[in-house]
Amino acid sequence: SEVEYRAEVGQNAYLPCFYTPAAPGNLVPVCWGKGACPVFECGNVVLRTDERDVNYWTSRYWLNGDFRKGDVSLTIENVTLADSGIYCCRIQIPGIMNDEKFNLKLVIKPAKVTPAPTRQRDFTAAFPRMLTTRGHGPAETQTLGSLPDINLTQISTLANELRDSRLANDLRDSGATIRIG
């Protein structure tokens, strides 16, 4: 499975991934990694849960949803162009080769700057030498990475508001979802 999500530099990105626990509290280990899903595990792990809790995370990466109910969607805080790429959400279902894995594409748009002093843009991996040339500065609210065909401005609510909104259901329907049990 492969879907693309977008966010703007300086904002928070949201990568949806869900499963349905067989029973309340009967959790399945999950890992998030940078780069496409390998055969086993996650490469370049940024966050991991076990049967009870989040047991490993790195700065800027967190689960904002209720992971105990199977919402293991990843939020990446204050993104840069270097966060562009493929992210692997792996639901580590017990048994041989039972894992469900999802490759999600995250595209980061450069923050726009007004006025435009030059026509040349240096789209680095934002590694340090990023130059952008137009538009407005980063939004004051933290815009979440959008689904395809959903405008960023349409979903500029804070990440924790998203969980209770109707959009959460839309994300659940079009994001990575797996039912267990």
Epitope: E4, R6, K34, G35, N44, L81, A82, S84, G85, K105, V107, I108, K109, P110, R119, Q120, R121, D122, F123, T124, A125, A126, F127, P128, R129
Partner: antibody
Framework: QVQLQQSGPQLVRPGSSVQISCKTS????????MHWVRQRPGQGLEWIGS????????SLNQKFMDKATLTVDKSSSTANMQFSSPTSEDSAVYFC????????????WGQGTLVTVSA | DIVMTQSHKFMSTSIEDRVSITCKAS??????VAWYQQKPGQTPKLLIY???YRYIGVPDRFTGSGSGTDFTFTITSVQAEDLAVYFC?????????FGGGTKLEIK
Amino acid sequence: QVQLQQSGPQLVRPGSSVQISCKTSGYSFTSYLMHWVRQRPGQGLEWIGSIDPSDSEISLNQKFMDKATLTVDKSSSTANMQFSSPTSEDSAVYFCARDFGYVAWFVYWGQGTLVTVSA
Amino acid sequence: DIVMTQSHKFMSTSIEDRVSITCKASQDVSAAVAWYQQKPGQTPKLLIYSTFYRYIGVPDRFTGSGSGTDFTFTITSVQAEDLAVYFCQQHYSVPWTFGGGTKLEIK
């Protein structure tokens, strides 16, 4: 699925001009930069430049500043490159390539257009 | 312009061997290096971006490492279908530049 379909091979005279088209499908044309890359026989890859189809903003390799003209036709989701005053040194396969999105690694490539410059 | 140098034009290997291809940048490019595979008569295929990260559909045997100016692309167990030319590319600053390529051959 994403497809980039380039125009056919061309035999051109030195000093004339050559136009190559790259018709795209399977994605939102204005959401990604389109790049042009060339490969001379038995050689490496050389980035010519890129164009943002949303506003036709162009970034060109200085080496090709006076040679390459990049345009887009949004109505047909097509990118074009015109190459002026070619010499035998410009005989190469020319590729259009779509980037990942605001970062310059090239995920999708056209099949290439062979340009032969010969008198 | 940043010059990307692949010192070996050719490398010989045997099936199931481990092989590493190196690429040197003329200045610091942080971790902004991609690797491509090109088979005869085909277009380049993105394998690795930002030094370490495999693109979708790329087998686990392909890995990348390095930082700054020195980068390495490794195939941990070469398969027959891996015989191709491999290019590095910096995506740190324009103009984006490629290495000259390393052709992987069977001994």
